[in-house]
């Protein structure tokens, strides 16, 4: 039973109120890296002039009407769009990355919805049709999160272009004060 989506709007109808937890992280898959290992040092790394801790995950507020075919909400709803880069300060403020936290070609951290809220809206329809009551799922907060196989590209496209893959060269990843002590913290953080 997936979410039933409005035809003309990215906002989704939801069956009930509540918070929707992030799916679990991908299991370790023993993939090896597929990269040239012994090339010379590149002349520079992208973003070397910029402090990696500068990037942030922003919450942009948008107000819009919810539509369902010819019907439109009586009042506009305010929701968040997640935007921005995910730098290490946003990922795990007290961490340093060691091999334990390394992932092949990732993990890919994106600025994506963290929590959702449900709002009841009344849809007004033309032609004297009776108003419809609906619950819609709206983004309530954003967070830098590790993408998993559960976050597919069609899901990502709704987060806006800035939420798409961080620019090439350096992708945030995880590490810890004492890695063992922080493992649970890391696993719960995303």
């Amino acid at each position: 039973q997936g979410w039933q989506a409005f035809k003309n709007d990215a906002t989704e109808i939801i069956p009930e109120l509540g918070e929707y937890p992030e799916p679990p992280p991908e299991l370790e898959n023993n993939k090896t890296m597929n990269r040239a290992e012994n090339g010379g040092r590149p002349p520079h790394h992208p973003f070397e002039t910029k402090d990696v801790s500068e990037y942030s995950c922003r919450e942009l507020h948008f107000t819009r009407y919810v539509t369902d075919g010819p019907c439109r909400s009586a009042k506009p709803v305010t929701e968040l769009v997640c935007s921005g880069q995910c730098g290490p300060a946003r990922l795990l403020p007290n961490a340093i990355g060691r091999g334990k936290w390394w992932r092949p070609s990732g993990p890919d951290f994106r600025c994506i919805p963290d929590r959702y809220r449900a709002q009841r809206v009344q849809l007004l329809c033309p032609g004297g049709e009776a108003p419809r009551a609906r619950k819609v799922r709206l983004v309530a907060s954003c967070k830098c999160k590790r993408l998993t196989r559960f976050h597919n590209q069609s899901e990502l496209k709704d987060f806006g272009t800035e939420a798409a893959r961080p620019q090439k060269g350096r992708k945030p990843r995880p590490r810890a004060r004492s890695a063992k002590a922080n493992q649970a913290e890391l696993e719960n953080a995303y």
Partner: antibody, heavy 126, light 111 residues
Framework: QVQLQQSGAELVRPGTSVKVSCKAS????????IEWIKQRPGQGLEWIGV????????NYNEKFKIKATLTADKSSSTAYMQLSSLTSDDSAVYFC???????????????????WGQGTSVTVSS | KIVLTQSPASLAVSLRQRATISCRAS??????????MHWYQQKPGQPPKLLIY???NLESGVPARFSGSGSRTDFTLTIDPVEADDAATYYC?????????FGAGTKLELK
């Protein structure tokens, strides 16, 4: 080219402090880690701690938590290690080394200490 | 804490022969099929020099006679053939987790 230049040898009295510097050049200082390593004469290598100059995050070896204080100055691309309440056990050569943080993906992924300072000899003697 | 046990403690090898140094970790240092074990060479009065990173990758500028192998807990550094310039102490090191640890070192001498 990448270089880590450490401060000169120190002869210090027991009970005092010393601050060793490690000036980085030839790469983006804030995008890599600086590790600190101790080597007593004729002995092996012992990890003291690490600092991420970009975020200021520090991890210490439990053994050196009280002894060492790591800092970094982004404006001068210099990392520092202060050793306090010095005793003869602290007489050693101290190295700084550049390391790679697994939070990031690099074009050429090493994730090891690929550049080292020349070492700073600290002798504690009355 | 991951303990690295290096063997032998010292090794005497003739020129142009093969030298093999072993490093055993008290627990796995692998993540997604990549081993966070590295090998360094140190000569008296000098800082350590990175030879092999992530178990088997030759660092830029290091002669191809150095090679590394192994995974999880068992790793090997091989020098073949040994040259006069290779007389030094060799250390394995893990950065799978903090605290970073080094092996006790293997002193390579030439016969």
């Amino acid at each position: 080219q990448v270089q880590l230049q450490q401060s000169g040898a120190e002869l210090v009295r027991p009970g005092t402090s010393v601050k060793v510097s490690c000036k980085a050049s030839g790469y983006a200082f804030t995008n890599y880690l600086i590790e600190w390593i101790k080597q007593r004469p004729g002995q092996g290598l012992e990890w003291i701690g690490v600092i991420n100059p970009g975020s200021g995050i520090i991890n210490y070896n439990e053994k050196f938590k009280i002894k060492a204080t790591l800092t970094a100055d982004k404006s001068s691309s210099t990392a520092y290690m202060q050793l306090s309440s010095l005793t003869s056990d602290d007489s050693a050569v101290y190295f700084c080394a550049r390391d790679w943080d697994t939070f990031y993906s690099y074009e050429r992924e090493v994730y090891a200490m690929d550049y080292w300072g020349q070492g700073t000899s600290v002798t504690v003697s009355s | 804490k991951i303990v690295l046990t290096q063997s032998p403690a010292s090794l005497a090898v003739s020129l142009r022969q093969r030298a093999t140094i072993s490093c055993r970790a008290s627990e796995s240092v692998d993540s997604y099929g990549n081993s966070f074990m590295h090998w360094y060479q140190q000569k008296p009065g000098q800082p350590p020099k990175l030879l092999i990173y992530r178990a088997s990758n030759l660092e830029s500028g290091v002669p191809a006679r150095f090679s590394g192998s192994g995974s999880r807990t068992d790793f090997t550094l091989t020098i073949d053939p040994v040259e006069a310039d290779d007389a030094a102490t060799y250390y394995c090191q893990q950065n799978y987790e903090d605290p970073l640890t080094f092996g006790a070192g293997t002193k390579l001498e030439l016969k």
